[in-house]
Interface confidence: medium
């Protein structure tokens, strides 16, 4: 099953009746799978086999960095248990698998190149154009994204991370709404209070009035 | 104090249905989201459906889209979970858990006793 | 090889102080996802022990004593669960599981069984 149809309605609300933060988005790494045999936004943490060193960028918390390869990245719970298929297939919209092979020596070029076709060098990727934010062997570098009509671009790609973008003011996106900005809430259900504002990367925040939680 | 029970499960053989019931209370039920997890014997744990505090968004692990529906009756601070055309595979104990639905926090943190399902010819 | 890593089994004597470890897949960055620790006592439902996200962010389970603590290792993409003063009812089965802090995703090791020595 693909993982757009994880959910059977379209996320419109928070999950509980407070909402909780986005966690921040890396830069380099994949997010842990949202569907058995798929990963979210990471196009080169996609294909596990040739994803090398941590990138040390990471997106600042409640940024969306676009991806070549794009995915709902829907809330769900996924077993791993001995024996069970978590292995990431390689849904490639826009490279050949080919690209993700090893070198014969099994090196890679490291974040801000890609692997030539013909040379078998390192080439640096065009600052503005593309990026490569991990270790890799792709015969070209990612393309840079342009933000949406419904986001503020928050820093521009440079050849190690693709462009970073923001909900404009006023609305936000958190996991249930991964491909759009959503309006802020204007006030909390009954018997909340709130304790945060909204902010790009999440709706107001509200708690129960009552304040025995205990563990939060 | 925060109670789950789960009722309903049983024997049942393969390609027949049962519905799972969970009972709430100790909490106020229409603020949390719920969910269904499950346990085959001597195995993990394994995630199998969610649904948010009004019952407008619902969730579901790959292995039962299609075959199992989650729901909730919040008059009645109860959850469901509508299971057909079973398979072996789908023998475990079934939990009923909370979401914990608080600022920051996205854990299960209460869980019921269980009801056992069993698919068998 | 699967996303989380959990070892199958450790042991530590009564008193004693253990650390659980839960080793996240190289492709994934540990910081930037919340680390959840449970416990499964035999023939008992999972109970909430722990999240842990940072020093500054992380959250007890209902009546877990703090002898349960949660940290991290962002540069061995790792998490912790330590166990102080163990006691014979720490001996269970302990599921970490990671996610995001705003979503239900979570994703389950595969356990550890920790049993606790006389």
């Known amino acids: 099953a693909s993982g757009t149809e994880a959910a059977t309605a379209t996320p419109s609300k928070v999950w509980g009746s407070s909402a909780g933060r986005i966690e921040p988005r890396g830069g380099g790494r994949g997010a842990l799978p949202t569907s058995m045999g798929q990963q979210g936004p990471s196009a080169q943490a996609r294909a596990g086999r040739v994803v090398g060193p941590r990138s040390a960028q990471g997106a600042s918390p409640g940024l969306r960095v676009h991806k070549t390869l794009k995915f709902v990245v829907v809330g769900v719970l996924l077993q791993v248990v001995p024996g069970s298929a978590a292995t990431i297939k390689v849904h490639d919209q826009s490279v050949g698998t080919q690209q993700w092979e090893h070198s014969p020596l099994g090196e890679l070029c490291p974040p801000g190149s890609h692997r030539s076709e013909h040379s078998g060098a390192c080439n640096q990727c065009t600052e503005g154009v593309g990026y490569t934010s991990a270790s890799n062997n792709l015969f070209s570098c990612l393309p840079c994204t342009a933000c949406k009509s419904d986001e503020e671009e928050r820093s521009a790609c440079t050849r190690t991370r693709n462009t970073a973008c923001q909900c404009k003011p006023g609305t936000f996106r958190n996991d249930d709404s991964a491909e759009m900005c959503r309006k802020c809430s204007t006030g909390c259900p009954r018997g909340k209070v709130k304790v945060k504002d909204c902010t790009p990367w999440s709706d107001i925040e509200c708690v129960h009035n009552e304040s025995g939680n205990g563990h939060n | 104090e925060v109670q789950l029970v789960e009722s309903g499960g049983g024997l049942v053989k393969p390609g027949g249905s049962l519905r799972l019931s969970c009972a709430a209370s100790?909490?106020?039920?229409?603020?949390?989201?719920m969910h269904w997890v499950r346990q085959a014997p001597g195995k993990g744990l394994e995630w199998v459906a969610g649904i948010n505090y009004s019952g407008n968004n619902k969730y579901y692990a790959d292995s039962v889209k299609g075959r199992f529906t989650i729901s909730r009756d919040n008059a009645k601070n109860s959850l469901y979970l509508q299971m057909n055309s079973l398979r072996a595979e789908d023998t475990a104990v079934y939990y009923c858990?909370?979401?914990?639905?608080?600022?920051?926090?996205?854990?299960?943190?209460?869980w019921g006793q269980g009801t056992l399902v069993t698919v068998s010819s | 090889q699967p996303v989380l890593h959990q070892p199958p089994a450790m042991s530590s004597a009564l008193g004693t102080t253990i650390r659980l470890t839960c080793t996240l897949r190289?492709?994934?960055?540990?910081?930037?996802?919340?680390v959840y620790w449970y416990q499964q006592r035999p023939g008992h439902p999972p109970r909430f022990l722990l999240r842990y996200f940072s020093q500054s962010d992380k959250s007890q389970g209902p009546q877990v004593p703090p002898r349960f603590s949660g940290s991290k290792d962002v540069a061995r993409n790792r998490g912790y669960l330590s166990i102080s003063e163990l006691q014979p009812e720490d001996e269970a089965m302990y599921y970490c599981?990671?996610?995001?802090?705003?979503?239900?995703?979570?994703?389950f090791g595969s356990g550890t069984q920790l049993t606790v020595l006389s």
């Open positions: 100790g909490f106020t039920f229409s603020t949390y989201g």
């Open positions: 858990a909370r979401d914990s639905s608080t600022t920051r926090t996205r854990a299960l943190d209460y």
């Open positions: 190289n492709d994934h960055d540990i910081g930037v996802y919340s």
């Open positions: 599981a990671m996610g995001a802090r705003s979503s239900v995703t979570h994703v």
